[in-house]
């Protein structure tokens, strides 16, 4: 199957790349994290319609089986193919540690 | 946040790994597989509550910000989190050829 | 756009102090900390040390314990780094750097000259 | 503290050829690793971080590859504005390190 990069719902209605702007509060993290407080957080969003950026043959799979048993099988879902690092200065025991997460902002999308 | 297993909305609903019994033409495989006739398909399906079994802090995020943007951001999404191999045999131009699949069942299954 | 501005060049005598400024604009200051980072003339960059401009939290360099304060005024969105007991070879530009959320930092302030000479 | 260690010291190069500098870190860092452009007089400017990943604005003949312990910028064709010192730098852990530089002067 093609792994198709155009939207056949429109422009932007597809699985792609959102960026959220969200505070330490919003995440639940405002009483551990110094820095940054807060945070543009890149995930992803959107629909994934037939053959719209398939991330292996599981997720073409789902989608046969979802337009045939629509109530049983779900559409394949928007989620990260690859993450970005991401830098956080923290509270600790004894003061402050620099911390990198490897899985906490989305890169880009596919749908599985 | 704790990578929960019991289901808050009760047995069987959260995300977890099901098997759906699907025959070549469902898949849209009959032109090109000649074995298996049938398949049973193992994938993941049912919903992602709080804290369970989240992938990643990437979840976790996306969990905080659903519940405080629940239009704009998504509940995370129940996904394979590893594939069992299987083995197609095939046609090809010059007869019939056996091809192993790394992608195409889930073996177990997350919140993303 | 982001901007750190530092105050102007400095000429002190060895064992005096100084006490170096970065105004921030373009951003929520307490958002973000700042890094004090020197450059000796012709030499490598070296990190001395960085302040939560949130809540005042600070990470020195080993070898600048002792010597150095860094603070902030969220009321002027200012960051300062001061520096005791001078000697010839802390004579250097003296940058401010505010954090990024991917640890490398495209924001610098334009530096500082702090002279040490008897 | 990790110490990153730059090479060549210094680079001659014609424009238009390609230039690869390297930086090695003493112990690994992942891929917490940043790459600066510095001229004269001028503070550094971020090119690369995430040891791959080209910071706004920087053209995409600069590149970053490696993790861990050993690290690559190359400038694919280099430009006369691109003759300058490059630095990297590890953020994995507290104190930030700086490799010595590599100056990259016109042949």
């Known amino acids: 199957a093609r792994n198709g990069d155009r939207c056949p719902l429109g422009p932007g209605r597809c699985c792609r790349l959102h960026t959220v702007h969200a505070s330490l509060e919003d995440l639940g993290w405002a009483d551990w994290v110094l820095s940054p407080r807060e945070v543009q957080v890149t995930m992803c969003i959107g629909a994934c319609p037939s053959q719209f950026r398939e991330a292996n043959m599981h997720a073409q799979i789902k989608m046969n089986l979802h337009r045939l048993k629509p109530d049983t099988v779900p559409a394949p879902c928007c989620v990260p193919a690859s993450y970005n690092p991401m830098v956080l200065i923290q509270k600790t025991d004894t003061g402050v540690s620099l911390q990198t997460y490897d899985d906490l902002l989305a890169k880009d999308c596919h749908c599985v | 946040a704790r990578n929960g297993d019991r289901c808050p909305l009760g047995p069987g609903r959260c995300c977890r790994l099901h098997t759906v019994h699907a025959s070549l033409e469902d898949l849209g495989w009959a032109d090109w597989v000649l074995s298996p006739r049938e398949v049973q398909v193992t994938m993941c399906i049912g919903a992602c509550p709080s804290q369970f079994r989240e992938a990643n802090m990437h979840a976790q995020i996306k969990m905080n910000l659903h519940r405080l943007k629940p239009d704009t951001v998504p509940a995370p999404c129940c996904v394979p989190a590893s594939y069992n191999p299987m083995v197609l045999i095939q046609k090809t131009d010059t007869g019939v050829s056996l091809q192993t699949y790394d992608d195409l069942l889930a073996k177990d299954c997350h919140c993303v | 756009q982001v901007q750190l501005v530092q105050s102007g060049a400095e000429v002190k005598k060895p064992g005096a102090s100084v006490k170096v400024s970065c105004k921030a604009s373009g951003y929520t200051f307490d958002s973000y900390g700042i890094n004090w980072v020197r450059q000796a003339p012709g030499q490598g960059l070296e990190w001395m040390g960085w302040i939560s401009a949130y809540s005042g939290d600070t990470a020195y360099a080993q070898e600048l314990q002792g010597r150095v304060t860094m603070t902030t005024d969220t009321s002027t969105s200012t960051a300062y780094m001061e520096l005791r007991s001078l000697r010839s070879d802390d004579t250097a530009v003296y940058y401010c750097?505010?954090?990024?959320?991917?640890?490398?930092?495209?924001?610098w302030g334009q530096g500082t000259l702090v002279t040490v000479s008897s | 503290e990790i110490v990153m260690t730059q090479s060549p010291a210094t680079l001659s190069v014609s424009p238009g050829e390609r230039a690869t500098l390297s930086c090695r870190a003493s112990?690994?860092?992942?891929?917490?690793l940043a790459w600066y452009q510095q001229k004269p007089g001028q503070a550094p400017r971020l090119l690369i971080y995430g040891a791959s990943t080209r910071a706004t604005g920087i053209p995409a003949r600069f590149s970053g590859s490696g993790s861990g312990t050993e690290f690559t910028l190359t400038i694919s064709s280099l430009q006369s504005e691109d003759f300058a010192v490059y630095y990297c730098q590890q953020y994995n852990n507290w104190p930030i390190t700086f490799g010595g530089g590599t100056k990259v002067e016109i042949k």
């Open positions: 112990q690994s860092v992942s891929s917490n």
């Open positions: 750097v505010r954090d990024t959320q991917y640890g490398g930092s495209p924001y």
